[in-house]
Amino acid sequence: LEVQVPEDPVVALVGTDATLCCSFSPEPGFSLAQLNLIWQLTDTKQLVHSFAEGQDQGSAYANRTALFPDLLAQGNASLRLQRVRVADEGSFTCFVSIRDFGSAAVSLQVAAPYSKPSMTLEPNKDLRPGDTVTITCSSYRGYPEAEVFWQDGQGVPLTGNVTTSQMANEQGLFDVHSVLRVVLGANGTYSCLVRNPVLQQDAHGSVTITGQPMTFPPEA
């Protein structure tokens, strides 16, 4: 029995619902009473949802899963996963048995966009060209881990003296803090780009130095 799932991972935003597509080709005269359908986690074999003996056996996965009962007879064995969490990320296997047997695995990639970075500067008072300052770019509650890039006002990448740390919170979402240590020129813009590699989402923050007096309110 041929079971089909998408080759590409299913990307779902944290907190939204995701559909893990799975289909089979029922033979003429097929009856749901003949169908055994099992969704399980590929790695641990933990049961997620099942259909057997003509009945939906329900969710075994935090009551956040559902089938599409009206579409089963047409060979649609897709699984709806509600309120996606970071912990849901991984591979799900769809097992279909009628007389014959088939299975396929679909990957769920969880993502969350990063917030607009907040920029802080220290020292932030009485600065002069030549001072060494640390510019911190902070962006919150994203997933997966971000890629962080720094550049000057001309778009030239700033790679030296950058330290980036990422910490996961209780929900598994990351807060990213990237620190650029730089010697100030007379004028200049320092920009930070926080990229979500899955969503290809870029969040920008920048701080501009416009000569003396050099004070740096965070950008709105």
Epitope: E122, P123, N124, K125, D126, R128, P129, G130, D131, T132, V133, T134, Q212, P213, T215
Partner: antibody, heavy 119, light 108 residues
Framework: EVQLQQSGAELVRPGASVKLSCKTS????????IHWIKQRSGQGLEWIAR????????FYNEKFKGRATLTADKSSSTVYLQLNSLKSEDSAVYFC????????????WGAGTTVTVSS | DIVLTQSPAIMSASPGEKVTLTCSVS???????LYWYQQKPGSSPKLWIY???NLASGVPARFSGSGSGPSYSLTISSMEAEDAASYFC?????????FGSGTKLEIK
Amino acid sequence: EVQLQQSGAELVRPGASVKLSCKTSGYIFTSYWIHWIKQRSGQGLEWIARIYPGTDSTFYNEKFKGRATLTADKSSSTVYLQLNSLKSEDSAVYFCHFITASDWYFDVWGAGTTVTVSS
Amino acid sequence: DIVLTQSPAIMSASPGEKVTLTCSVSSSVNSNYLYWYQQKPGSSPKLWIYGTSNLASGVPARFSGSGSGPSYSLTISSMEAEDAASYFCYQWSSYPFTFGSGTKLEIK
């Protein structure tokens, strides 16, 4: 009220080192620069360097680079000036100086520490 | 380095006389960071004028400051005995911060 309390006078031998202290109070220590100024007897004032205790960021006058070191101790809100390889021309009064023009205009000097370099 | 040249080095003034001290800068400075200090023997310098023309707290109104690059001045409209002191101009606009060599003002 911003206050700067400097350590007592020092008599040191040529070639030796000395560490002067400036204990601060009355403001957020980590949020403002502290400067050090040198004044030889009956002469003008020379800016040595400054330090921002929040990040230990420093900037030195080239003339004093290598022989003067500024450090800050956050636990005691104290800034230190260490002078190495002392010579007779280092004999002077050394002042610590709080100055800002950023969110308020303020200017406070310590009473000064007299350093005498003599054999 | 920015050189601050003060003149005269020493001057005497009679009570009631108008006095002008000058400070010439070798290259441009931001006038917000041009300060004047008064110092009396055995004491720390005291901020007298900040930002070229603003009188520090407690400074008598007979003092005034003015100027723009390359010349700045401190003026006493009517000299008094208590004004006898050394006066230093100071720029902390560009590194290294620099002081003028001072003017010693004496009372006649």
